[in-house]
């Protein structure tokens, strides 16, 4: 950066080189020369000279004024005219960069997603403060006080084998930068309450044309847990509006759940499951479209493809006519 | 067992400035610690001045009458941490002590012997 | 969160049941300790964990209580517990408004 250049003075940035964006700022340069008494001093942002708001403070120093100053970042440098020289002379440079303190992190959250090994804890981190922020998770044991932190720029994954403080903790995000420092309120988790049941799965369809014709969707989980409750959401691709089929399930077979639907019209579906009377759903399963067939006597057997949609931490979902994420509380 | 050992204090002009220091034996200086400092004034009741959190990374926390005059670090090498006190008041005058149980938990086992600043002119 | 402690002075005698309390102005769920402090030495450790006895402390010492509202009980009063008592939140520090973690102490002192 411009901070590594050799000075012949020094640049200084009052109230601070990293201050509340909107802020009145100064600029000042003062130089150092030998043998040189500048005519002038000039101050360049990102590259470009100055040209107003400047005043010479005395021979050696000159103040740059800001008003309201917006930009995150900027590179200033200033330079002298000396006699005798041709071009300008440098004299030094910083980095400046403006922003906002941290709101206080809210909706903080964690799940274990099964099999992962992690306990992954969330936040609403909220505006965005240009500056460098950064976020110290801390989770203390309710039965035992012993506290752990975890610093991060984002969301963190916390393996499960260091919670060895038993099944209840608090936990709390603390959020930091040049400009200021917030804390979220505490959450109080029990490790066996936050456990997301391993993807659920739609795998095929099956449309049986009877008198009246029903459709089959076959899905599965491998999940482990015992008592599972699901639900399938499904439309035609042209409506707007989900209906939603509600499970108690077993997962130590494919499930097979019936639809009747109408003729000739593509569906999409999802299914997303949770541990009976937990607090966390699995996000939607990736969208699964099927076509039904027109009204013809005979058994059609039919895989429909899968959309390959992200669906990691958080999934998008078509809801009504608009991207939502599905993977929170209920 | 953990011991803690105070050293530092004394007579020191208000405006001015001192370092405490607090060598500690014991401990696990690997795992995941807290170590804080509180003081008493004559005749007063403990307050809390901040701690240090020594884990994956390092962090510091203040009661909001002590932030801006008083910073608190460590030297892992030594198995020492410091209380850097400025700005002296009159008011500061107290017996300050470092505290700590050794690991993360807040509450205080170990308390060291203190040691006595006074701030006088 | 501040800590209020009641009461700020006590006399009782020897054999006495005594109770101090202490209140928290916000949740701090079991996050409190007692400190038993004598004139020149340092505070030592009583209870943890709102009710956990120190290693080393008299099973006549005893605390309670969750949430905001905590208690000291000593069932009989010996010689040696004319002291001053504080307790000390343990939940958090983190907090940026935290002037102070202990109670302001309450002075036990012998009746008469």
């Known amino acids: 950066g411009i901070t590594n250049i050799n000075c012949s003075g020094h640049i200084w940035v009052e109230p601070a080189t990293i201050f509340k964006m909107g802020m009145n700022i100064s600029i000042y340069c003062q130089a150092a020369i030998k043998n040189c008494q500048p005519r002038q001093l000039h101050f360049y942002k990102n590259g470009i000279k100055e040209r107003f708001e400047i005043t010479r403070i005395n021979k050696t120093t000159a103040r740059l004024w800001y008003k309201n100053f917006l930009e995150p970042h900027a590179s200033m440098y200033c330079t002298a005219e000396c006699p005798n020289h041709f071009q300008e002379t440098l004299i030094c440079g910083k980095d400046i960069s403006s922003g906002y303190p941290p709101d206080v992190p809210d909706e903080v959250t964690c799940v274990i997603y099964e099999y992962s090994g992690n306990m992954t804890c969330t936040w609403n981190a909220g505006k965005l403060t240009y500056v460098d922020t950064k976020y110290v998770v801390h989770v203390k044991s309710l039965e035992t006080e012993e506290e752990q932190q975890y610093l991060t720029s984002s969301y963190i994954n916390i393996s499960t084998d260091s919670l060895q403080g038993g099944k209840k903790y608090l936990v709390w995000v603390q959020a930091e930068n040049a400009l200021g420092m917030e804390e979220s309120k505490q959450l109080q988790i029990h490790l066996d309450d936050i456990v997301i049941p391993s993807a659920s799965i739609i795998s095929r369809a099956e449309t049986i044309n009877a008198t009246v014709p029903k459709t089959i969707i076959y899905w599965d989980s491998q999940t482990t847990i015992e008592k599972v409750s699901c639900e399938m959401r499904y439309k035609a691709t042209t409506n707007q509006t989900w209906n939603v089929k509600e499970f108690d399930t077993n997962f130590t077979y494919v499930q097979q759940s019936e639809f009747y639907l109408e003729p000739n019209i593509k569906y999409i579906f999802q299914v997303r499951c949770q541990e009976t009377g937990k607090r966390y759903w699995q996000a939607w399963s990736s969208p699964f479209f099927h076509k039904t067939t027109e009204t013809v006597p005979q058994v059609t057997s039919k895989s429909s493809q899968h959309n390959t949609w992200n669906s990691g931490l958080t999934v998008a979902s078509i809801s009504t006519g608009h991207l939502t994420s599905d993977n929170r509380e209920d | 067992e953990v011991q803690l050992v105070e050293s530092g204090g004394g007579l020191v002009q208000p405006g001015g400035s001192l370092r405490l220091s607090c060598a500690a034996s014991g401990i696990d200086f690997n795992s995941n610690y807290y170590m804080c400092w509180v003081r008493q004034a004559p005749g007063k009741g403990l307050e809390w001045i901040g701690c240090i959190y020594v884990g994956s990374h390092v962090n510091t926390y203040y009661a909001n009458w002590a932030k801006g005059r008083f910073t608190i670090s460590r030297d892992n090498s030594k198995n020492t941490v410091y209380l850097q006190m400025n700005s002296l008041r009159a008011e500061d005058t107290a017996v300050y002590y470092c505290?700590?149980?050794?690991?993360?938990?807040?509450?205080?086992?170990?308390w060291g012997q203190g040691t006595l600043v006074t701030v006088s002119s | 969160i501040q800590m209020t402690q009641s009461p700020s002075s006590l006399s009782a005698s020897v054999g006495d049941r005594v109770t101090i309390t202490c209140q928290a102005s916000e949740n701090i769920y079991s996050f409190l300790a007692w400190y038993q402090q004598k004139p020149g030495k340092a505070p030592k450790l009583l209870i943890y964990s709102a009710s956990k006895l120190a290693a080393g402390v008299p099973s006549r010492f005893s605390g309670s209580g969750s949430g905001t509202d905590f208690t000291l009980t000593i069932s009989s009063l010996q010689p040696e517990d004319f002291a001053t008592y504080y307790c000390?939140?343990?939940?958090?520090?983190?907090?940026?408004?935290?002037?102070?973690?202990f109670g302001q102490g309450t002075k036990l002192t012998v009746l008469g």
């Open positions: 000390q939140q343990t939940n958090r520090y983190s907090n940026p408004d935290i002037y102070n973690v």
């Open positions: 505290a700590t149980s050794g690991s993360s938990v807040l509450y205080f086992k170990f």
